[in-house]
């Protein structure tokens, strides 16, 4: 029973991580640059995302524009976009496998096959988690590097956007969920149990006759 609870917990965490990756991908806040004007009215913030840029004025007015093409997307964000999309697809495969191999589903009859499927799902979630943590950490590294670079103008110094924190949370959930599913070992005493059970059944049948 404890094993089933662990499995449900693992799947739940991984699914939450998968949803968080989607959020991280969609949010246009990977890099944030604030431009402070001579007065508060002229202050603006530029958000850079994987799909669009947004200009947020101090009045609260926000205008976003989807990149005209890949031409407009900086190389690091291009790579991040690719990895995050692959991570979403990989995590979706993990969700599918975890449903197939779940203890409370009947897609597979064999308990050993179910357990193995669940381990594969765990590994897939771990891979998805790594695919998110790489671009998120790389983008953060670049921002931090620029922040402490004396050659970079003060106005040019960016901050880490909300998408990066969501990305870290997503990778954490995927890694944790995947790890829990990998701990789900296949039953070692599977064969002896079924043998004993059939023997007992035949004995009872002969006595009855």
């Amino acid at each position: 029973m404890a094993s089933m609870g662990l499995q449900v917990m693992g799947i739940a965490l991984a699914v939450l991580g998968w949803l968080a990756v989607m959020l991280c991908c969609a949010l246009p806040m990977w890099r944030v640059t604030a431009f402070i004007g001579s007065n508060i009215v002229t202050s603006q913030t530029i958000w850079e995302g994987l799909w669009m840029n947004c200009v947020v004025q101090s009045t609260g007015q926000m205008q976003c524009k989807v990149y005209d093409s890949l031409l407009a997307l900086p190389q690091d964000l291009q790579a991040a976009r690719a990895l995050v999309i692959i991570s979403i697809i990989v995590a979706a495969l993990g969700v599918l496998l975890s449903v197939v191999g779940g203890k409370c589903t009947n897609c597979l009859e064999d308990e050993s096959a179910k357990a193995k499927t669940m381990i594969v799902a765990g590994v897939v979630f771990l891979l998805a988690g790594l695919m998110v943590i790489v671009p998120v950490s790389w983008t953060a590294h670049n921002i931090i590097q620029d922040f402490y670079n004396p050659l970079v103008a003060s106005g040019q110094k960016r901050e880490m956007g909300a998408s990066l924190y969501v990305g870290w949370a997503a990778s954490g959930l995927l890694l944790l969920g995947g790890g829990l599913l990998c701990c789900n070992c296949p039953p070692r005493t599977d064969k002896p149990y079924s043998a004993k059970y059939s023997a007992a059944r035949s004995a009872a049948a002969s006595n009855y006759v």
Partner: antibody
């Protein structure tokens, strides 16, 4: 110190191809976009095209069919090639560096001195 | 392409306040920038993001606007400000410049 310098032939025959070079220093072409802008004598600035830091290019709609912008990052050079030149292509050609990497940061604090191209037979 | 329309020429006396306008055919958010060009020189960035002064630009220059209507204000005008002023947008690809406003001093 950021510097850009344009170089070219000065005089080009009509229907010939123009080749200009923008040599940069003080920054990497892998980090910033470089645009080409031209200015016919006594007229205003005309945006020609851009070479993005990721190696992709974008051209002005009227010039798109005759224009090619390329680069050599090892030599820190951006090239402009324009074919089938006409007398109306006579202009001062400038290259300039963008403020930052992303398309949205499309303002240009650093400019070259420009090179005058005259199209005449 | 986004077309930027500027007032063609202005003549003012030193010490006065002058406003140069730039209108876009479609919204450019606040991604409008202003350049000053003196005869025989390359353009010089004055203002970026509609209202932010580039480093080393005197405080008498200021910019405002959002969407389609933008203004560059010089107050007070100095004799050294005789030049052509261009607006440029970077919201819509391809980027475009205005035709320029020639500022002359009386």
């Amino acid at each position: 110190q950021v510097q850009l310098k344009e170089s070219g032939p000065g005089l080009v025959q009509p229907s010939q191809t123009l080749s200009l070079t923008c040599t940069v220093s003080g920054f990497s072409l892998r980090s910033y976009g470089v645009i080409w802008v031209r200015q016919p004598p006594g007229k205003g600035l005309e945006w020609v095209g851009v070479m993005w830091n990721n190696g992709n290019t974008e051209y002005s709609s009227p010039l798109k069919s005759r224009l090619t912008i390329s680069r050599d990052t090892s030599k820190s050079q951006v090239f402009l090639k324009m074919n089938n030149l006409q007398t109306e292509d006579t202009a001062m050609y400038f290259c300039a560096r963008s403020w930052d990497t992303n398309h949205i940061y499309g303002w240009f604090p650093y400019w070259g001195q420009g090179t005058l191209v005259t199209v005449s037979s | 392409d986004t077309v930027l329309t500027q007032s063609p020429a202005l003549a003012v006396s030193p010490g006065e306040r002058v406003t140069i306008s730039c209108r876009a055919t479609e919204s450019v958010s606040t991604l409008m920038h202003w350049y000053q060009q003196k005869p025989g020189q390359q353009p010089k960035l004055l203002i970026y993001l509609a209202s932010h002064l580039d480093s080393g630009v005197p405080a008498r220059f200021s910019g405002s606007g959002s969407g389609t209507d933008f203004t560059l204000t010089i107050d007070p005008v100095d004799a050294d400000d005789t030049a052509t002023y261009y607006c440029q947008q970077s919201w819509n690809a391809p980027y475009t410049f205005g035709a320029g406003t020639k500022l002359e001093l009386k």
